[in-house]
Amino acid sequence: LMGGQDKPFLSARPSTVVPRGGHVALQCHYRRGFNNFMLYKEDRSHVPIFHGRIFQESFIMGPVTPAHAGTYRCRGSRPHSLTGWSAPSNPLVIMVTGNHRKPSLLAHPGPLLKSGETVILQCWSDIMFEHFFLHREGISEDPSRLVGQIHDGVSKANFSIGPLMPVLAGTYRCYGSVPHSPYQLSAPSDPLDIVITGLYEKPSLSAQPGPTVQAGENVTLSCSSWSSYDIYHLSREGEAHERRLRAVPKVNRTFQADFPLGPATHGGTYRCFGSFRALPCVWSNSSDPLLVSVTGNPSSSWPSPTEPSSKSGICRHLH
């Protein structure tokens, strides 16, 4: 990470993408350590900010305002040089969010993908944003940036992610910006969880009392595996939301979750997946599909005593 040729390395923690009112720590790493440093904000004047103040190890900037957005550099303390300071560091762009209404983020073909596939994340808005930015939660490097394409009163950008590996799974958000303030970003889109499946062995899915039930009869779907999955995810074909439950170790050394579906009113095809707490967005292969049939008087929907997960939140731990 070190900058070469007497250049320090400037970084931001936890991220270069900072919400209005939030805080960010700027760290200037120089000569195998964090020394005294000066910070510069590259407005066209290239004048040191903070009235030439000297910082030790890191500087916590905030609460940030749109004026904090921009490009920063640092110089490390170098007592025996002519100037007393190192060459300027790498440029670091700080982006401040919450300055415009949020865009929308969609995944094509969908947010559940097999390892090795490619997904298109489309960020769009009825605001004519000039640029769109895509950022993955927990990542400190700069977000990806694309120019918005304007068509039929909508501005959009298509970010191609892939081939998918576990490291690319996670929670994504996108932002928009306008020309005169390219680093003053919009509010974040709603989070979108990109899940990679097919990395571990498939669990088995069964129905109690069985896959064919009478209308009104209580049905429970059980997902189990010899693998020590922490969480099971149950999806129904044609439904956007998955349900999830913590896996429970059983006496037969399997790990199981029982999803009560309530009184049967409507059939459907179900699949389940397992995942580990450490990598909540990396799932197993799908179980074999299970077709649940209801005899008698089917209605149009199945009640959900198990609270469905929100549109996002898959990639956050179950507490």
């Epitope: 919450g98 209404r101 009825d126 004519m128 306008v178 020309p179 005169h180 303030s181």
Partner: antibody, heavy 115, light 107 residues
Framework: QIQLVQSGPELKNPGETVKISCKAS????????MNWVKQAPGKGLKWMGW????????TYADDFKGRFAFSLETSASTAYLQINNLKNEDTATYFC????????WGQGTLVTVST | DIKMTQSPSSMYASLGERVTITCKAS??????LSWFQLKPGKSPKTLIY???RLVDGVPSRFSGSGSGQDFSLTISSLECEDMGIYYC?????????FGGGTTLEIK
């Protein structure tokens, strides 16, 4: 369709205050910032600044810092320009214009400052 | 501040003639330039944004070109209704700045 309708002409004495309104329709008001532009008689256009309609934050060009104030009434999709302590050189037509590239303009409000 | 130099400041042209107005920025403004038409007693009309993108409803005889520092607005075949004052605007950086204007009159 998108429309910006400004309030009518104003005749004021030096030292007084004027408040011009700009009512937007045909789009989501908070989607686009509102710019204000001055045109003095026989002169060109001068950008005064803009107000972020999402956050309410105004930004003023150097020549318009101090006596000039931008404000919003978001519920009424209306932006305002207030000029305090009017001077003769404030006599001009003032335009509101929305969006980063000033896509749509109001019809202008003539402010005349005269004793 | 970025200075926008527009030329000519005024011109006469005949109906059907091809007319070009230029605008030069004092520094690189990417393609963040708009063109406007002003007529007495009317709202200014936005013709072009992003240097070359025609605003919906603007006749196709208007076109814009350029990037960086040098830009131009062209009317391919002048019509009577095109007389007025034309302004360029850079919106790459705050404060926005307009060119000085070009008064276009019919010969």
């Amino acid at each position: 369709q998108i429309q910006l309708v400004q309030s009518g002409p104003e005749l004021k004495n030096p030292g007084e205050t004027v408040k011009i309104s700009c009512k937007a329709s045909g789009y989501i008001f908070t989607n686009y910032g509102m710019n204000w532009v001055k045109q003095a008689p026989g002169k060109g256009l001068k950008w005064m600044g803009w107000i972020n309609t999402y956050t309410g934050e105004p930004t003023y060009a150097d020549d318009f810092k101090g006596r000039f104030a931008f404000s919003l009434e978001t519920s009424a999709s209306t932006a305002y320009l207030q000029i305090n302590n009017l001077k003769n050189e404030d006599t001009a037509t003032y335009f509101c214009a929305h969006g980063p590239w000033l896509a749509y303009w109001g019809q202008g409000t003539l402010v005349t400052v005269s004793t | 501040d970025i200075k926008m130099t527009q030329s000519p400041s005024s011109m006469y042209a005949s109906l059907g003639e091809r007319v070009t107005i230029t605008c030069k920025a004092s520094q690189d403004i990417n393609s963040y330039l708009s063109w406007f038409q002003l007529k007495p007693g009317k709202s200014p009309k936005t013709l072009i944004y992003r240097a070359n993108r025609l605003v919906d409803g603007v006749p196709s005889r208007f076109s814009g070109s350029g990037s960086g520092q040098d830009f131009s607005l062209t009317i391919s075949s002048l019509e009577c209704e095109d007389m007025g004052i034309y302004y360029c605007l850079q919106y790459d950086e705050l404060p926005y700045t307009f060119g000085g204007g070009t008064t276009l009159e019919i010969k």
